[in-house]
């Protein structure tokens, strides 16, 4: 049979997902119901590996599968009739498959830094980069991340800095390729903690009797993490700035003369059974010298006529020595110290003085 040459196809339409493209087109010849169509699909920059699809007669759509996400392709469509008589020119259309979303990403805290490290493996296919969104309450930040390659299964990472401590952040990462955006991958991550900010003031110390004092102080600010505990420290020495070193000394060490500074009382804030908000500053009042025991620290009686200063240590993380049961490991804890209070001098023991006078 003799056939006239089919005219060229027109109005090519493409709809894509990550790995497939559905193509539809038109041919306005009266004889078009007798045509089949030959499709050549070529990945940009890879003409040696074209895929060919031939439709059944009269079919003006086709789905091409096993494509690479986020990649650019060109399709050429020839109309053909009879024994391979083709249209002079193919209809041509360029398109991109949709980029693949990141499967997931992990967050890691950075010790003692208000930052998060995000880690992910590159999604399959091609990408031009990623959009990173970080938000918490009214604060938000959007930045771009560079592209990655999925070929060798490398783990990629980025550090998100200038955050707040102990704060929950909503994070989303979106793959971009060919001007298209994948569905965002979301995660909620919380930053770590560090030493609390030291308070401006010092505790207030007042004499109650010849062997006890009352120490009053305000709770530390919780902006670097929730305050987990406080330690009340006494000294009879020169009141320099205390270091984590003093946390190992107990009343017994003080009595033996091993140290002029010791921890007399420990408060675990969780025991209050309420969470402290950032703006809520609690007031504490401690009776020092009442012979109570908190963990490994004995709150022993003070020396009459002794001169004492008090300081408070606040902890966002309190760690105890594995071998010295109940004693704080200063090096492993997250701690800061108030300044020492003014000194208070205890009165003499009136009863003892009276007893001495009668003999």
């Amino acid at each position: 049979a003799q056939y006239t040459r089919p005219s060229n196809v027109s109005n090519i339409d493409v709809s894509t997902n990550t790995t497939a493209a559905t193509l539809s087109w038109q041919n306005f010849d009266d004889a078009s119901p007798t045509y089949s169509y030959c499709l050549l699909i070529e990945k940009a920059g890879n003409s040696s590996n074209a895929t060919q699809v031939v439709t059944d007669i009269g079919i003006t759509d086709a789905t091409v599968t096993e494509l690479i996400p986020g990649s650019s392709y060109t399709v050429e469509i020839f109309a053909q009739v009879g024994d391979g008589i083709k249209s002079l020119e193919p209809g041509r259309k360029s398109f991109c498959t949709d980029p693949a979303s990141m499967a997931s990403f992990d967050c890691e805290v950075v010790p003692k830094e208000p930052a998060l490290v995000l880690k992910w493996t590159c999604p399959p296919g091609a990408n031009a980069g990623f959009e990173l969104e970080v938000s918490s309450g009214a604060w938000n930040n959007a930045t771009h991340l560079e592209s990655c390659s999925s070929e060798n299964g490398t783990e990629y990472r980025t550090e998100v800095t200038y955050l707040n401590f102990s704060t929950s952040y909503n994070i989303s990462i979106t793959t971009v390729s060919c001007g298209k955006m994948a569905a965002p991958t979301r995660n909620t991550c919380t930053t770590g903690i560090t030493d609390p900010p030291p308070p401006d003031g010092s505790p207030n110390i007042t004499s109650v009797s010849h062997n006890s004092v009352k120490v009053k102080f305000s709770g530390f600010e919780a902006s670097h993490g929730p305050i987990k505990a406080y330690a009340v420290i006494l000294t009879t020495g020169e009141a320099g700035h205390p270091s984590a070193d003093v946390l190992k000394y107990t009343y017994e060490d003080f009595k033996k003369g091993a140290s002029d500074t010791y921890v007399t009382y420990l408060i675990r804030t969780e025991e209050k059974g309420r969470s402290q908000s950032l703006s809520e500053v609690l007031k504490y009042e401690i009776d020092v010298g009442n012979e109570s025991t908190t963990l490994g620290y004995y709150n022993g009686k003070l020396e009459p006529l002794g001169s004492y200063r008090a300081c408070v240590a606040g902890f966002t993380n309190i760690t105890f020595h594995p071998q010295n049961k109940g004693l704080i490991d200063g090096a492993e804890s997250y701690v800061s110290f108030s300044r020492y209070s003014d000194a208070v001098s205890l009165p003499q023991d009136v009863a003892a003085a009276h007893h001495h006078h009668h003999h």
Epitope: A128, G129, E131, E133, N140, A142, H144, G179, M181, A183
Partner: antibody, heavy 117, light 107 residues
């Protein structure tokens, strides 16, 4: 085929409000960062506002901060720009656009906003 | 804000000629630069961006180059349909900013 169609422009007096809409089709709207860009008559282009996909974070140029609000309705595939306390210098054609990696890829045909007494 | 200085303000070219438009950023923008073409009464059209060396449907006679603060758009073999205003734009930092535009005319 990606299509963005802006509407809601018109003549408005200084100090009054106007709400622009941008109807999106041909792509998965909820996946995209979106923006409004404006162009004053015979002038250049100026980015106005931006909204992300994940948590809908918003960003504005300083001159419209506190007066304009960008928002999106993913169910309706529509982007909005609520413009309050309008000034004569807000007179422009307003375009909505997709904005992956900081580039305005697809643009609508624009809607003209004229602020005049 | 990052300032984008575009040169020249206008130029005219003959059919088949090669033209270049330059864009200078006031600070490094890590290649997050895009070029647009706008014809009278029409919306701008993306030509080239960080993510798209050449956007869909843009003829291969358009090319972009540059890094750091200096970028350029080259149009080889000038055609009548290339007439219009060309804008560069940085998408590195908010607020995203455009150059003032370059008007390209056919001689």
């Amino acid at each position: 085929e990606v299509k963005l169609v802006e509407s809601g422009g018109g003549l408005v007096q200084p100090g009054r409000s106007l709400k622009l809409s941008c109807a999106a089709s041909g792509f998965t709207f909820s996946n995209y960062y979106m923006a409004w860009v404006r162009q004053a008559p015979t002038k250049g282009l100026e980015w106005v506002a931006y909204i992300t996909n994940g948590y809908g974070s918003t960003y504005y140029r300083d001159s419209v901060k506190g007066r304009f609000t960008i928002s999106r309705d993913n169910a309706k595939s529509t982007l909005y720009l609520q413009m309050d306390s309008l000034r004569s210098e807000d007179t422009a054609t307003y375009y909505c656009s997709t904005v992956p990696l900081g580039a305005f890829v697809y643009w609508g045909q624009g809607t003209l906003v004229t602020v005049s007494s | 804000d990052i300032q984008m200085t575009q040169t020249p303000h206008s130029l005219s070219a003959s059919l088949g000629e090669t033209v270049s438009i330059e864009c200078l950023a006031s600070e490094g923008i890590s290649n997050y630069l895009a070029w647009y073409q706008q014809k009278p009464g029409k919306s701008p059209q993306l030509l080239i961006s960080h993510a798209n060396p050449l956007h869909d449907g843009v003829p291969s006679r358009f090319s972009g180059s540059g890094s750091g603060t200096q970028y350029s758009l080259k149009i080889r073999n000038m055609q009548p349909e290339d007439e219009g205003v060309y804008y560069c734009q940085q998408g590195y930092k908010f607020p995203y900013t455009f150059g003032a535009g370059t008007k390209l005319e056919l001689k």
